[in-house]
C-alpha cells in the first residue's frame, strides 16, 4: 500500500521536511502533490512526468518545493502555514490512480526566555514572589529550575498559568537561589538566564565574639558583633546602657577593673526595619605575677644527681602545671610532683632530660606560663669511636685518625701509641707511614666536669702485604626459605678490592645474592639448602692479595615429607614388618610412629615380628625438626592376608 512518511514529523520553522514515499507502484506515468487531504487542482503544488523527467509547478507552488524521481517531496525553509496534510496522486501507465496522504506539524524555533518578577526585594516570612517566564508562546511547555535542579516539592511553591508562573509564598532566606525557566516545544528547548532572588531578612539575634567573658587587667578588649542579615546589619555598641559607637567591632586597649560591666550589641536592618540586641557581661580581674622556675642543681651529673625544679612564686589556692618539651608531663617513675604540684623532681637525670621545662599558674581566666628552662646535664664521656674503621694501611700513605665521644661538656682528647702519650687533640695525623707505625693506637676521652675518662684501642697494621682475611656472619644457622645471611669480609682495609667465591667458583648471578659495602658484604636472601656451600672472600690491592679460609653455611631445613620404605603395602601373615622412615632435614629430625592413630615408638625404624591380620591399618610416620620448628608426616596403609590367600606376594623380611 502506498504510504507517506514525514521526516521529521515535527518541523522547526526555517528547516526542511521530506515527504518520503513508500511502496510506490511499478509502471507509472507520473505523480502530483497537493496541499490538503484530497486532490484539488487549485491546491496542486507540483507535478512530475516520468517519461520527460519534467517537473511542473502548480497553483500552490511556493518555490520551496522540490520533487524527486521517486515521488518524494522536499519542502525547504518551512513556515508555520506549511503545517497540515499533503496528498500524493499517482497516475499509473494504465491510467488507474492511487492516492496517499501524509502530514507534518510546524513549530517555531523558540526564543531565549526571560524571567519577570513582581517583587525584586521580598521580605522573609512576609512577602510572596511571582516569577513569570516570558514570552508567552503557543504550544510551548514551561519548566522551572532552582540552582539547576528541578523544583523541590514544597507547599510554598506553586505553579500556575500553564506552569508559566512560579509563585513562592512566605519567602525565606533559603529561597535565595538561582532561578531559571525553560520553554520547550517538539522542535526546540531554550533556557533563560538565571535570576537570583534577593530575600531581605534579619537581623537575627547577634553573636558577640570571642565568647570568653573574663579578662586580665592590662589586656586589650576586642569584641566583634555579627548578625545574619540582608542587607548587612548596621551595628551599635552600648556599655552599661550608654551608647559607645556605631561599628561592628568594639576595641578598648589596656583595660582595668573599671571596664567590667554589661556590653550590648544592637543590630539594625534598614530595609526590614528590624532591630535585635545581645548582651554579654565582661569581668576584668587584677593580673597575677608571671611565674618562673628555680632549680636546686644547675649542672646535674647523669645517672648520679637528682634535680628539683620549683615554680615560683608560692601563691595560696593556686593550681600549678608543668610541661616538658611543650607536652604535658609523661608518666615516669623518675618524675615526681610535690603535693601542691609546685615542685617537680627528676630522679637520676639522664642526658635526655634537658627539657625545656615550663611551669604555669592557673587562675580564673587562663594559664600564665613561665619562661622555659633548659637543664645542663653533665654526661659522658661515652666510649670513644675512632674513625675511619680501617685497620690495615700500606706504607707511604698518610694516617689520619679522628676520635669522638659523646660528652657534656665536650670531651678533651689524648692519643697514645703503644702506651706512649702523643698529643692532646681530637685528631691524630701521621704522614707517609711505614711498618714502624704499626701498633696499638689509644684514644682517651676525658670529661673535666664529671672527672670521668674512657678509652678505645685500635690495632693499626702498616704492611705492603694484606693480611689473611676472615669471614664473619650475622647468622650461623639460618632457616631455609625464611632467613637471610650477611657475610662480611674482615678486616676493612683502605684502597682494597673485595672478592667472593662459592665452592671455588666466582659468584653466580642470582636475585638472591647481593653485594654491598664496597663488595665487603655478601647477603644471601631467603636461603635454601642449596646455599650450604663453602664461601671464601679475598682481598687484593696493587701489591698483594689474600684469601680467607672457607666458611661453610649451615642451612637449617626440613623436615621434608617423609618416605616409608619398603614401598610394599600387602603382607602375608607370619612375616616380619620392618618399616623405615626417612625425611630430608638439617639437623636430623626426630621420628615417631602411630598405628591407627595410637602413638608407638620414637625411632626411625618400626619393627613388628610375625604380623597377623590384626596388624592391618594405617601406619603414620611423624618427623619433627626442633631447630626449624617444622613438622611433617606421611601415612601408609598396610594389609596383612592370611597365609596362602595373598595373590603372589612374598613375605616381608
Amino acid at each position: 500500500k502506498l504510504t507517506i512518511e514525514s521526516t521529521p514529523f515535527n518541523v522547526a520553522e526555517g528547516k526542511e521536511v521530506l515527504l518520503l514515499v513508500h511502496n510506490l507502484p511499478q509502471h507509472l506515468f507520473g505523480y502530483s502533490w497537493y496541499k490538503g487531504e484530497r486532490v484539488d487542482g487549485n491546491r496542486q503544488i507540483i507535478g512530475y512526468v516520468i517519461g520527460t523527467q519534467q517537473a511542473t509547478p502548480g497553483p500552490a507552488y511556493s518555490g520551496r518545493e522540490i520533487i524527486y524521481p521517486n515521488a518524494s517531496l522536499l519542502i525547504q525553509n518551512i513556515i508555520q502555514n506549511d503545517t497540515g496534510f499533503y496528498t500524493l496522486h499517482v497516475i499509473k501507465s494504465d491510467l488507474v490512480n492511487e492516492e496517499a496522504t501524509g502530514q507534518f506539524r510546524v513549530y517555531p524555533e523558540l526564543p531565549k526566555p526571560s524571567i519577570s518578577s513582581n517583587n525584586s526585594k521580598p521580605v522573609e516570612d512576609k512577602d510572596a514572589v511571582a516569577f513569570t517566564c516570558e514570552p508567552e508562546t503557543q504550544d510551548a511547555t514551561y519548566l522551572w529550575w532552582v540552582n539547576n535542579q528541578s523544583l523541590p516539592v514544597s507547599p510554598r511553591l506553586q505553579l500556575s498559568n500553564g506552569n508559566r508562573t512560579l509563585t513562592l509564598f512566605n519567602v525565606t532566606r533559603n529561597d535565595t537561589a538561582s532561578y531559571k525557566c525553560e520553554t520547550q516545544n517538539p522542535v526546540s528547548a531554550r533556557r533563560s538566564d538565571s535570576v537570583i532572588l534577593n530575600v531581605l531578612y534579619g537581623p537575627d539575634a547577634p553573636t558577640i565574639s570571642p565568647l570568653n567573658t573574663s579578662y586580665r587587667s592590662g589586656e586589650n578588649l576586642n569584641l566583634s558583633c555579627h548578625a545574619a542579615s540582608n542587607p548587612p546589619a548596621q551595628y551599635s555598641w552600648f556599655v552599661n546602657g550608654t551608647f559607645q559607637q556605631s561599628t561592628q567591632e568594639l576595641f578598648i586597649p589596656n583595660i582595668t577593673v573599671n571596664n567590667s560591666g554589661s556590653y550590648t550589641c544592637q543590630a539594625h536592618n534598614s530595609d526590614t526595619g528590624l532591630n535585635r540586641t545581645t548582651v554579654t557581661t565582661i569581668t576584668v580581674y587584677a593580673e597575677p605575677p608571671k611565674p618562673f622556675i628555680t632549680s636546686n642543681n644547675s649542672n646535674p651529673v647523669e645517672d648520679e644527681d637528682a634535680v628539683a625544679l620549683t615554680c615560683e612564686p608560692e601563691i595560696q589556692n593556686t593550681t600549678y602545671l608543668w610541661w616538658v618539651n611543650n607536652q604535658s608531663l609523661p608518666v615516669s617513675p623518675r618524675l615526681q610532683l610535690s603535693n601542691d604540684n609546685r615542685t617537680l623532681t627528676l630522679l637520676s637525670v639522664t642526658r635526655n632530660d634537658v627539657g625545656p621545662y615550663e611551669c604555669g599558674i592557673q587562675n580564673e581566666l587562663s594559664v600564665d606560663h613561665s619562661d622555659p628552662v633548659i637543664l645542663n646535664v653533665l654526661y659522658g664521656p661515652d666510649d670513644p669511636t675512632i674513625s675511619p674503621s680501617y685497620t690495615y694501611y700500606r706504607p707511604g700513605v698518610n694516617l689520619s685518625l679522628s676520635c669522638h665521644a659523646a660528652s657534656n661538656p665536650p670531651a678533651q682528647y689524648s692519643w697514645l701509641i703503644d702506651g706512649n702519650i702523643q698529643q692532646h687533640t681530637q685528631e691524630l695525623f701521621i704522614s707517609n707511614i711505614t711498618e714502624k707505625n704499626s701498633g696499638l693506637y689509644t684514644c682517651q676521652a676525658n670529661n673535666s666536669a664529671s672527672g670521668h675518662s674512657r678509652t678505645t684501642v685500635k690495632t693499626i697494621t702498616v704492611s705492603a702485604e694484606l693480611p689473611k682475611p676472615s669471614i664473619s656472619s650475622n647468622n650461623s644457622k639460618p632457616v631455609e626459605d625464611k632467613d637471610a645471611v650477611a657475610f662480611t669480609c674482615e678486616p676493612e682495609a683502605q684502597n682494597t678490592t673485595y672478592l667472593w667465591w662459592v665452592n671455588g667458583q666466582s659468584l653466580p648471578v642470582s636475585p638472591r645474592l647481593q653485594l654491598s659495602n664496597g663488595n665487603r658484604t655478601l647477603t644471601l636472601f631467603n636461603v635454601t639448602r642449596n646455599d650450604a656451600r663453602a664461601y671464601v672472600c679475598g682481598i687484593q690491592n696493587s701489591v698483594s692479595a689474600n684469601r680467607s679460609d672457607p666458611v661453610t653455611l649451615d642451612v637449617l631445613y626440613g623436615p621434608d615429607t617423609p618416605i616409608i620404605s619398603p614401598p610394599d603395602s600387602s603382607y602375608l601373615s607370619g612375616a616380619n614388618l620392618n618399616l623405615s622412615c626417612h625425611s630430608a632435614s638439617n639437623p636430623s629430625p626426630q621420628y615417631s610412629w602411630r598405628i591407627n592413630g595410637i602413638p608407638q615408638q620414637h625411632t626411625q625404624v618400626l619393627f613388628i615380628a610375625k604380623i597377623t591380620p590384626n596388624n592391618n591399618g594405617t601406619y603414620a610416620c611423624f618427623v619433627s625438626n626442633l631447630a626449624t620448628g617444622r613438622n611433617n608426616s606421611i601415612v601408609k596403609s598396610i594389609t596383612v592376608s592370611a597365609s596362602g590367600t595373598s595373590p603372589g606376594l612374598s613375605a616381608g623380611a
Epitope: I46, Y61, S62, G63, R64, Y68, L74, Q76
Partner: nanobody, 119 residues
Framework: EVQLVESGGGLVQPGGSLRLSCAAS????????IGWVRRAPGKEEELVAS????????RYADSVKGRFTISADTSKNTAYLQMNSLRAEDTAVYYC????????????WGQGTTVTVSS
C-alpha cells in the same frame, strides 16, 4: 503563475564572459534555493551553481569554481550567473532551477538559454 525565465545566452569566444539572468515569478527567491543547471549533447546534466538566500550559502561544481559566480537580487526576484574565462566545454543549454539545499537535487521548467563558446 509560477515561472522561471532564463536570458543572457549567446556566442562567445574562449576566455570571454557572459552574464545569465533568471527572472522568477509566482514565488519569492529569498525563500528558497535557486541554481543553474546545464545540458550539453553527449554529456551528463550538471548543476553548476546554487544560492540559498535564506541561509546565505552558495555552492559550485568543481568544473566552474573560480570562474563562475552566482548571485540573486531579491528586490528584482532575479538570479544571475556571471561566467568568466569561458571554455569550449562550457557550451550547453543553461536552465534556471529550484535546488534542494541538502543533496543538491533540482527541478527546472524554464526554456533555458544557450551558451556557445567557440572561436
Amino acid at each position: 503563475e509560477v515561472q522561471l525565465v532564463e536570458s543572457g545566452g549567446g556566442l562567445v569566444q574562449p576566455g570571454g564572459s557572459l552574464r545569465l539572468s533568471c527572472a522568477a515569478s509566482g514565488f519569492n527567491i529569498k525563500d528558497t534555493c535557486i541554481g543553474w543547471v546545464r545540458r550539453a549533447p553527449g554529456k551528463e546534466e550538471e548543476l553548476v551553481a546554487s544560492i540559498c538566500k535564506y541561509t546565505g550559502k552558495t555552492r559550485y561544481a568543481d568544473s566552474v569554481k573560480g570562474r563562475f559566480t552566482i548571485s540573486a537580487d531579491t528586490s528584482k526576484n532575479t538570479a544571475y550567473l556571471q561566467m568568466n574565462s569561458l571554455r569550449a566545454e562550457d557550451t550547453a543549454v543553461y536552465y534556471c532551477a529550484i535546488v534542494a539545499s541538502g543533496d543538491g537535487w533540482y527541478n527546472y521548467w524554464g526554456q533555458g538559454t544557450t551558451v556557445t563558446v567557440s572561436s
